[in-house]
Every structure is written in structure tokens, then in C-alpha cells.
């Protein structure tokens, strides 16, 4: 359960991959598309509003036997739109929604080496936002692999 309905803190940051490709958002046909691309030097990076929430997480709900206080995050690149996990399609999508946000909009934040982060689906433990074919996708990670796969590592730059 998420402790309280308001975030403990928020920050604006640009999101890039471990290999320094930018995550960008474009309005197309009244819906937003998410791209992973090399940005031209003079192009401004898109910013995302990260809202951080605390969550008590019993071990029975998680794929890795972890229990305790976790940090959850929602990601909003533009007003009223949030990144959401579509577990059926293994995709990451931008949806317009009102608060309270659905569980699909919450991701467990993992700090990683080299000051990278990973985003694990609240609704599907062991599944992370990752990069596949220049798009964001949901990627199942085997915990025995130490979660070191570069395709689920992201950098936050304020």
C-alpha cells in the first residue's frame, strides 16, 4: 500500500538511457508517442515530472523476496499524462488520467551503479521499463542476473 496520497517530493528531470540516448515525447494524432533517440546537440531535452511516494511492500507481493519501505515513482512528461505499464502488451504507454492514479502508473525506483536508476512495475514485480528497438517496453528481468542489464538502466538529469 502506498503511504498517503501525496508525494514526499517531486523533481523535474530529463530521462536518458545508459547509452545516453534521450527519451522524448511527441504528440501525434491526439495521443503521445514515446521515442528513444539520439538528440541533436542544440535540441532541448524533454523534462519529466517525477513524483516520489513511499510504499510498504510485503514480501509476498514481490518477485524477489524484498519487503519493507520502498520508493515508488510516477512519471509525467506533460500535464495530466502519465507513463503507464501495459502488462498485456509488454509496452509502456502515455495515458491521460485523473488522480488517484491507477497502479499501472507506479514504478518501484531502484538505484543502480554509476548513478543510474531502474523502474520496476508495481503491478508486475520483476518487470522493468526498458529499451527495445528504440522504444520503451516492459522487460522481464531474472533476479539472478543482478538486474545489471544495460537496457533497463536510465539516467536522470535535472
Amino acid at each position: 500500500s502506498i503511504t498517503g496520497i501525496s508525494p514526499i517530493t517531486e523533481s523535474l528531470a530529463s530521462l536518458s538511457t545508459y547509452n545516453d540516448q534521450s527519451i522524448t515525447f511527441a504528440l501525434e494524432d491526439e495521443s503521445y508517442e514515446i521515442y528513444v533517440e539520439d538528440l541533436k546537440k542544440d535540441k532541448k531535452k524533454d523534462k519529466v515530472l517525477l513524483s516520489y511516494y513511499e510504499s510498504q511492500h510485503p514480501s509476498s507481493e514481490s518477485g524477489d523476496g524484498v519487503d519493507g519501505k520502498m520508493l515508488m515513482v510516477t512519471l509525467s512528461p506533460t500535464k495530466d499524462f502519465w507513463l503507464q505499464a501495459n502488462n498485456k502488451e509488454h509496452s509502456v504507454e502515455l495515458h491521460k488520467c485523473e488522480k488517484p492514479l491507477p497502479d499501472q502508473a507506479f514504478f518501484v525506483l531502484h538505484n543502480r551503479s554509476f548513478n543510474c536508476v531502474s523502474f520496476e512495475c508495481k503491478t508486475d514485480p520483476g518487470v522493468f521499463i526498458g529499451v527495445k528497438d528504440n522504444h520503451l517496453a516492459l522487460i522481464k528481468v531474472d533476479y539472478s542476473e543482478n538486474l545489471g542489464s544495460e537496457n533497463i538502466l536510465f539516467k536522470l538529469s535535472e
Epitope: V66, D67, G68, K69, L71, L109, N146
Partner: antibody
Framework: QVQLVQSGAEVKKPGASVKVSCKAS????????ISWVRQAPGQGLEWMGW????????HYVQKFQGRVSMTTDTSTSTAYMELRSLRSDDTAVYYC???????????????WGQGTLVTVSS | DIQMTQSPSSVSASVGDRVTITCRAS??????LAWYQQKPGKAPQLLIY???SLQSGVPSRFSGSGSGSDFTLTISSLQPEDFATYYC?????????FGGGTKVEIK
């Protein structure tokens, strides 16, 4: 309740090694990362590095790289910090501290061991 | 590395006083800043995390604010048990770094 209990004080000669233990109780040990922080007499706090109790991943501050090893034994819920090639300026109280979030270091340290005084003297 | 500079390094105050300690970062970051209290011969104790969130069990006279590169710890009405040394710590990125400490002494 959560407790981190550290091993007792040590006196070592320059060039020797010391291994400090930190036994955790009152929570699921492999859910939280452990950091090691030291404090020289009359000085401030200095972070040495971190280890994930979940998978053993670690990160050491550059100045300690090559001299420090942080390990965990999940069967006994114990974290260890070994410092080698001791010098007189390693004389300090060494603390283990639990990160307050299971998967993140953003929240600081919510529980600390009582500290272990390591004296390096010839 | 992010350097944390605390000021003042010491402050003399009386019971009931309002005390403010500041912490400045060498580069801006979000709100991942913690404050600790340490008494002689004891381990530090977490007071504030995420710049302004009060740790469970900590009295409400302690409060934190700030973001970017300037952060503040305020004790609204100093109590006898509050005479101690206070440290800030950035938890934003490795290496994690502490401020030099502020000693709050009895006037």
C-alpha cells in the same frame, strides 16, 4: 525492533588489516542496503561505501578503493567491512548504517550500529 | 563529487530559541537531502529525509526545507536534549557526502 550490533573495539598496528562485523536483527536483512561510515576523533562523518544485502553488489569511495572490502552473510544477517594496509589516520569509529529504502539510497540511513573504535598505533 | 558546506560550524543558543542551520551543495540536485543529530559517544540519528520529511518518532519542532543547492534545518523551540551536533547528507548520488557538522551549544 531493528538493531545493528557491531563487533568490539580493535587496536591494530600500521600495515595490518581489520574486519568489523555488523549483525542485523528485527527486519528482513536482504531487503536493505548497508553503508559504512567512519568518524575520526573530533571530526565529521565520512561515507566509505555501500553494499546491497540482496545481491552483494557494492560501491566504494575512490579513496578506499583497493583497501576496503564490504561483504554480507545472509545466513547470519551480518555485514562485514574489512580495511587493509591500515595507517594511523584510519583511527576512527566505524559505523554500519541501514539505508531507509529497500531499493534506493535516496532516503539516507534510518538505523545505525553503535560504532566500533579502531585504533591504529605502533 | 557533491561537496556539502554547513553553516554555522557552531551556534550558541538558549532553551526555547529558534535555531536555523543551513547546508549548501556545490552543485544543485533534487530533494534527496537528510539531516542527522549526533550526541557525544553515540551514533547519528536520522531526523529529516527528502529535505523536508520528518523521520518517524522525531519531534515536530524539527523541520527541513529547501531544494537545489540550499537546504535548511530548523529547530523551532530548542529543548535541553537538542544540544548536539547536526549533519546534513546528500543522498542524491554516489559518493554520498556529509556536511562538516554544526555544533549547537548552550549559551
Amino acid at each position: 525492533q531493528v538493531q545493528l550490533v557491531q563487533s568490539g573495539a580493535e587496536v591494530k598496528k600500521p600495515g595490518a588489516s581489520v574486519k568489523v562485523s555488523c549483525k542485523a536483527s528485527g527486519y528482513t536483512f536482504n531487503s536493505y542496503g548497508i553503508s559504512w561510515v567512519r568518524q575520526a576523533p573530533g571530526q565529521g562523518l565520512e561515507w566509505m561505501g555501500w553494499i546491497s544485502s540482496h545481491n552483494g553488489n557494492s560501491h566504494y569511495v575512490q579513496k578506499f578503493q583497493g583497501r576496503v572490502s564490504m561483504t554480507t552473510d545472509t545466513s547470519t544477517s551480518t555485514a562485514y567491512m574489512e580495511l587493509r594496509s591500515l595507517r594511523s589516520d584510519d583511527t576512527a569509529v566505524y559505523y554500519c548504517a541501514r539505508h531507509s529504502y529497500t531499493t534506493s539510497w535516496y532516503g539516507g540511513f534510518d538505523y545505525w550500529g553503535q560504532g566500533t573504535l579502531v585504533t591504529v598505533s605502533s | 563529487d557533491i561537496q556539502m558546506t554547513q553553516s554555522p560550524s557552531s551556534v550558541s543558543a538558549s532553551v526555547g530559541d529558534r535555531v536555523t542551520i543551513t547546508c549548501r551543495a556545490s552543485q544543485g540536485f533534487s530533494s534527496w537531502l537528510a539531516w542527522y543529530q549526533q550526541k557525544p559517544g553515540k551514533a547519528p540519528q536520522l531526523l529529516i529525509y527528502a529535505a523536508s520529511s520528518l523521520q518517524s518518532g522525531v519531534p515536530s519542532r524539527f523541520s527541513g526545507s529547501g531544494s537545489g543547492s540550499d537546504f535548511t534545518l530548523t529547530i523551532s523551540s530548542l529543548q535541553p536534549e537538542d544540544f548536539a551536533t547536526y549533519y546534513c547528507q546528500q543522498a542524491n548520488s554516489f559518493p554520498l557526502t556529509f556536511g562538516g557538522g554544526t555544533k549547537v551549544e548552550i549559551k
